[in-house]
């Protein structure tokens, strides 16, 4: 058993049918010695008397808010949560496996630049009685500071019969140098509590590996005289790290016909312009990627050919 | 990216071309190592990230773009020597390009070259003959060093008398390639910045 926060405790259970469970001793936080009784949740049934209460915690029915009283007055509370270990592996019931970029990916994180700011998100089908708390650091043995905000519900989607809820959090490394070469990964730890179930999820990454630039901005077309060709131009996104000559991007320019089946013409360039043939009803799209470290491509910025 | 690429002209700055070749070569070598050594811990998540140049060179600090010198987090160990030389520098480009930066890059390359050559000698003794260092990568390191044209004492190749542990050598190769790739990215960024200055 360990303390998650004041008066909230997590009991770790080896979870299998007929498991013996864990013996837990609760102590009433009071100078009083006599006349103390214990109850669980809203029930008025007295579970025991005395300054300490010993319970065998086996199932969720044994978890909840234990309260010690004296003469009708509440002295203190202890909330017991359960953390299930199933065959040596901690349970992952609360969050959905996003399966991207690989199986067992519960937390996904992205950064728009090298400033040390990043966003993580996760999915669940649970709509109520759910709380998250997020901590982060650079490295784990001698952790350096990363400050995270509160997790918020960022999207709701309908997936078949189920509703899916997306939560996200923004974090900022306290003293980040965009040019630094990372040798210790960022660690992100999410505590999830659903009713009386506790779970924790972690992700470890280097900012360089989660970079995904915003799409190029100000995408414009300039027709070339007496030609089907156009000059496409664009700019670096505002959110990208500066100076751009140091934090350079490379670009992919795509000409896509109206039909998805039509052949796509693609050109790669390090410049912020390109000359392409603009077909009728086609659209031109441009996306960006770090020129020197191949992390994710940005989403496409698009303009119609007409 | 085996599709049409519009490549910029390296122009006045010969080192840019060499540094791009270096990054390509080390990335290819790392990919080859990951595939060949699939049963070894060779991915970025599995290895310890060690920097053999730590406390010996200060490339990131010495080559920091001027725009980032206002960022206190980038200045923890910044040295401020602005003397310029080295053949990559056109004499009129002196604002950011300090000798310290380019000589630091040269020292990095020299240290990695020695490590890679020592390692290759060990790998050649492996009866499995599983992996060797790409000669192209070693050649590209050499070319960039020559383009930088710094005179420095030659470091003797380390020789080891004890029987090599090939498992450890292959893991060390992965560690070295990951670190060298990160340094090659920094070098490329620096050269691109210098080229634009």
């Amino acid at each position: 058993i360990w303390e998650l926060k004041k008066d909230v405790y997590v009991v770790e259970l080896d979870w299998y049918p007929d498991a013996p469970g864990e013996m837990v001793v609760l102590t009433c936080d009071t100078p009083e010695e006599d006349g103390i009784t214990w109850t669980l949740d809203q029930s008025s049934e007295v579970l025991g008397s005395g300054k300490t209460l010993t319970i065998q915690v086996k199932e969720f029915g044994d978890a909840g808010q234990y309260t010690c009283h004296k003469g009708g007055e509440v002295l203190s509370h202890s909330l017991l949560l359960l953390h299930k270990k199933e065959d040596g592996i901690w349970s992952t019931d609360i969050l959905k496996d996003q399966k991207e970029p690989k199986n067992k990916t519960f937390l996904r994180c992205e950064a728009k630049n090298y400033s040390g700011r990043f966003t993580c998100w996760w999915l669940t089908t649970i709509s109520t009685d759910l709380t998250f708390s997020v901590k982060s650091s650079r490295g784990s043995s001698d952790p350096q500071g990363v400050t995270c905000g509160a997790a918020t519900l960022s999207a709701e989607r309908v997936r078949g019969d189920n509703k899916e809820y997306e939560y996200s959090v923004e974090c900022q490394e306290d003293s980040a140098c965009p040019a630094a070469e990372e040798s210790l990964p960022i660690e992100v730890m999410v505590d999830a509590v659903h009713k009386l179930k506790y779970e924790n999820y972690t992700s470890s990454f280097f900012i360089r590996d989660i970079i995904k630039p915003d799409p190029p901005k100000n995408l414009q077309l300039k027709p070339l005289k007496n030609s089907r060709q156009v000059e496409v131009s664009w700019e670096y996104p505002d959110t990208w790290s500066t100076p751009h000559s140091y934090f350079s991007l490379t670009f992919c320019v795509q000409v896509q016909g109206k039909s998805k089946r039509e052949k796509k013409d693609r050109v790669f360039t390090d410049k912020t312009s390109a000359t392409v043939i603009c077909r009728k009803n086609a659209s031109i799209s441009v996306r960006a990627q770090d020129r020197y470290y191949s992390s994710s491509w940005s989403e496409w910025a698009s303009v119609p050919c007409s | 990216r085996n599709l049409p690429v519009a490549t910029p002209d390296p122009g006045m700055f010969p080192c840019l071309h060499h540094s791009q070749n270096l990054l390509r070569a080390v990335s290819n070598m790392l990919q080859k190592a990951r595939q060949t050594l699939e049963f070894y811990p060779c991915t970025s998540e599995e290895i310890d990230h060690e920097d053999i140049t730590k406390d010996k060179t200060s490339t990131v600090e010495a080559c920091l773009p001027l725009e980032l010198t206002k960022n206190e987090s980038c200045l923890n160990s910044r040295e401020t020597s602005f003397i310029t030389n080295g053949s990559c520098l056109a004499s009129r480009k002196t604002s950011f390009m300090m000798a310290l930066c380019l000589s630091s890059i040269y020292e990095d390359l020299k240290m990695y070259q020695v490590e890679f050559k020592t390692m290759n000698a060990k790998l050649l003794m492996d009866p499995k003959r599983q992996i060797f260092l790409d000669q192209n990568m070693l050649a590209v390191i050499d070319e960039l060093m020559q383009a930088l044209n710094f005179n420095s004492e030659t470091v003797p190749q380390k020789s080891s008398l004890e029987e090599p542990d090939f498992y450890k050598t292959k893991i060390k190769l992965c560690i070295l390639l990951h670190a060298f790739r990160i340094r090659a990215v920094t070098i490329d960024r620096v050269m691109s910045y210098l080229n634009a200055s």
Partner: antibody, heavy 115, light 112 residues
Framework: QVQLVQSGGGVVQPGRSLRLSCAAS????????MHWVRQAPGKGLEWVAF????????YYADSVKGRFTISRDNSKNTLYLQMKSLRAEDTAVYYC????????WGQGTMVTVSS | SYVLTQPPSVSGTPGQRVTISCSGG????????VKWYQQLPGTAPKLLIY???QRPSGVPDRFSGSKSGTSASLAITGVQAEDEADYYC????????????FGTGTKVTVLG
């Protein structure tokens, strides 16, 4: 004590269907994940499928994906395996089993796919 | 499709020490717990070892399990005639958990 009693096995022709049941008693069935494991005659153990305690997630071996469906009725304390488009290579003893460090197995039920 | 490899058979005389190996990789045994089962002819498998080296109550202490790196092993010290059976190791793969990964199985024969 924990008990898993299996039923539903038998002889079936290729291409036909069969449903296996596993009745649980002696524990809170709705709190635990459950597996199906099979063993072809003279061969080793092969995992078939898994279902979460609440039925929210199901996992299948590639060899049965799209043909077999694992399900559970927590009100009846029963686990099921619906097998469709049966093949000769599905011939095996099928076991249900609880998920956890200490597990309990059913007695096994024989499924023979033969024309 | 078996990823965990066991020797097909091992044998020993009563009283001898018999060991069975189970070889896997970094994504299964290397990062997940290992179990061992004993299966007597015509019966369901019986759990002998869980969590690499833990013995459930009721399992004789001549059975012991261990794990090192990407391999695990089961030792029977002082093998007895009633130990003649098939033995299977089991683990998970970190990418496909909770799918069970079973070893190829080992037939233990007690001679004499």
């Amino acid at each position: 004590q924990v008990q898993l009693v299996q039923s539903g096995g038998g002889v079936v022709q290729p291409g036909r269907s069969l449903r296996l049941s596993c009745a649980a008693s002696g524990f809170t069935f709705s709190s635990y994940g459950m597996h199906w494991v099979r063993q072809a005659p003279g061969k080793g153990l092969e995992w078939v499928a898994f279902i979460r305690y609440d039925g929210s997630n199901k996992y299948y071996a590639d060899s049965v994906k799209g043909r077999f469906t694992i399900s559970r009725d927590n009100s009846k304390n029963t686990l099921y395996l619906q097998m469709k488009s049966l093949r000769a290579e599905d011939t095996a003893v099928y076991y249900c089993k609880t998920h956890g460090s200490h597990d309990n197995w059913g007695q096994g039920t024989m499924v023979t796919v033969s024309s | 499709s078996y990823v965990l490899t066991q020797p097909p058979s091992v044998s020993g005389t009563p009283g001898q020490r018999v060991t069975i190996s189970c070889s896997g990789g970094r994504s299964n045994i290397g990062s997940n717990p290992v179990k061992w089962y004993q299966q007597l002819p015509g019966t369901a498998p019986k759990l002998l070892i869980y969590g690499n080296d833990q013995r459930p109550s009721g399992v004789p202490d001549r059975f012991s399990g261990s794990k090192s790196g990407t391999s695990a092993s089961l030792a029977i010290t002082g093998v007895q005639a009633e130990d003649e059976a098939d033995y299977y190791c089991q683990s998970y793969d970190r990418g496909t958990h909770p799918a069970l990964l079973f070893g190829t199985g080992t037939k233990v024969t007690v001679l004499g």
